[in-house]
């Protein structure tokens, strides 16, 4: 078991891989969307700038009972250095408008694709 430890538990996922996997998951969500995502739930929109991953998690974590975004919520928690719980909003999170989860995911996906193309993986 000692010898296999490294094999069974590979080291940290490279940031580029983690970002690519998050993008793939968001693409999957948008393409498989038949009924309104999360039944039309609305969340706070975010500034897609510094602290974006934590802000995205802070917004989406409030939506419960929506299996379609549970994996995204888990993946975003890997990008956010601090623990995020429902109802928590950082000072970076400006609450100016709410949008449907479907639109939130589309906006986030477009921005993450741009970051990936530019090589900004963190």
């Amino acid at each position: 078991l000692t010898c296999l430890g490294g094999f069974a538990s590979p080291g940290p996922v490279p940031p580029s891989t983690a970002l690519r996997e998050l993008i793939e998951e968001l693409v999957n969500i948008t393409q498989n969307q038949k009924a309104p995502l999360c039944n039309g739930s609305m969340v706070w929109s975010i500034n897609l700038t510094a602290g974006m991953y934590c802000a995205a998690l802070e917004s989406l974590i409030n939506v419960s009972g929506c299996s379609a975004i549970e994996k995204t919520q888990r993946m975003l928690s890997g990008f956010c250095p601090h623990k995020v719980s429902a109802g928590q909003f950082s000072s970076l999170h400006v609450r100016d408008t709410k949008i449907e989860v479907a639109q939130f995911v589309k906006d986030l996906l477009l921005h993450l694709k741009k970051l990936f193309r530019e090589g900004q993986f963190n």
């Epitope: 309104p36 039944n39 039309g40 739930s41 609305m42 969340v43 409030n62 939506v63 419960s64 009972g65």
Partner: nanobody, 116 residues
């Protein structure tokens, strides 16, 4: 089970006022963030306003800022939306919603028609 019932809609002339109410049951109202959302004929959902559980935080869409006021009475499990200086573009079905829940848990809505 979450239940919400809106009332107070109707036909009003441009520049007029209406007060919408929403009675909530089936959840702990006083700790819930609450929203007003609207849907104009043939259009998508548009967020209108949000109020925090404590009433300390109130938030408005730019399109209604300065004209609409959201409030709540936790002792009556009731959410309100005071709508002043109404415009034709405010015509919509208005829904009260427990924040972050899907449409299946929203009320049936109340129709507001602004027309001369």
């Amino acid at each position: 089970e979450v239940q919400l019932l809106e009332s107070g809609g109707g036909l009003v002339q441009p520049g007029g006022s209406l007060r919408l109410s929403c009675v909530a049951s089936g959840f702990t109202f006083d700790v819930a963030e609450m929203d007003w959302v609207r849907q104009a004929p043939g259009k998508g959902l548009e967020w209108v306003s949000t109020i925090s559980p404590s009433r300390r935080g109130t938030y408005y869409a730019d399109s209604v800022k300065g004209r609409f006021t959201i409030s709540r009475d936790n002792s009556k499990n009731t959410l309100y939306l005071q709508m002043n200086s109404l415009r034709a573009e405010d015509t919509a079905v208005y829904y009260c919603a427990k924040a972050y829940t899907g449409r299946s848990l929203w009320g049936p809505g109340t129709l507001v028609t602004v027309s001369s």
